[in-house]
Interface confidence: medium
């Protein structure tokens, strides 16, 4: 018979032969042969593989480093990685939760809509027209542009969401 060029789901092609993949939680020890099945072994204590695979090494479980404010949210199994979260009152800096901050800051151009609490992170909002924020802060709201008119001045440079307006003296030549 012709050697296969493609294999079924949960199989892989090696030496012109379809072998079974190892199930999640197990690693490959040896490929199948004409006479033997694929040989797989369970991952060790702190290891995992989360897919049908032909990996010869299991992946290490993620370490939730307490020095970075991390703790284990869900302990890993032979088929799943450990899930880390931050200490109570702290917030992950990314979806992968590799480190923690007490409150996330709002970037320039954004102001704080709601200061963080123990259970919710800082809520930022874009500074609307007429307001600005030139700092990265977890507390500062958007500030209104300076009103040049109330100071008997004129706008010399328009404001943006990140900068205040620049006021200057009135043109004396105007009537």
């Amino acid at each position: 018979p012709e050697p296969p060029t493609a294999c079924r789901e949960k199989q892989y092609l090696i030496n012109s032969q379809c072998c079974s993949l190892c199930q999640p939680g197990q690693k490959l020890v040896s490929d199948c042969t004409e006479f033997t099945e694929t040989e797989c072994l369970p991952c060790g204590e702190s290891e995992f593989l989360d897919t049908w695979n032909r990996e010869t090494h299991c992946h290490q479980h993620k370490y939730c480093d307490p020095n970075l404010g991390l703790r284990v949210q869900q302990k890993g199994t032979s088929e799943t990685d450990t899930i880390c979260t931050c200490e109570e009152g702290w917030h992950c800096t990314s979806e992968a939760c590799e480190s923690c901050v007490l409150h996330r800051s709002c970037s320039p151009g954004f102001g704080v809509k709601q200061i963080a609490t123990g259970v919710s992170d800082t809520i930022c909002e874009p500074c609307p027209v007429g307001f600005f924020s030139n700092v990265s802060s977890a507390f500062e709201k958007c500030h209104p542009w300076t009103s040049c008119e109330t100071k008997d001045l004129v706008v010399q440079q328009a404001g943006t969401n990140k900068t205040d307006v620049v006021c200057g003296p009135q043109d004396r030549l105007r009537a």
Partner: nanobody, 116 residues
Framework: EVQLLESGGGLVQPGGSLRLSCAAS????????MQWVRRAPGKGLEWVSA????????YYADSVKGRFTISRDNSKNTLYLQMNSLRAEDTAVYYC?????????WGRGTLVTVSS
């Protein structure tokens, strides 16, 4: 290297006062918001108060509003927390923190015990 050193903690009776200090070095102090956080025995970290770099804007947790006052002296690179009308539930290790930085930039803390 960023260093933060808290001091001023101690044992105080309910209703008493304490003033905590935090000496900062290794960074341009006035550029950063600073804050105080605390950890009560067996509890998580709780944010207490923060202050803007120029010292003009201050922020407080509801639990300490009206009793605690945060301030800073940028010429001395020092952050302060004046604590009045202390209660048993204020017992905690108090830490100062630089900006809203990652977990690394924290002092070792100073223990405040409120007990009769």
């Amino acid at each position: 290297e960023v260093q933060l050193l808290e001091s001023g903690g101690g044992l105080v009776q309910p209703g008493g006062s304490l003033r905590l200090s935090c000496a900062a070095s290794g960074f341009t102090f006035e550029w950063y918001e600073m804050q105080w956080v605390r950890r009560a025995p067996g509890k998580g970290l709780e944010w207490v108060s923060a202050i803007s770099g120029d010292g003009y804007r201050t922020y407080y947790a509801d639990s300490v509003k009206g009793r605690f006052t945060i301030s800073r002296d940028n010429s001395k690179n020092t952050l302060y927390l004046q604590m009045n009308s202390l209660r048993a539930e204020d017992t905690a290790v108090y830490y100062c923190a630089k900006g809203l930085e990652y977990f690394d930039y924290w002092g070792r803390g100073t223990l405040v015990t409120v007990s009769s």
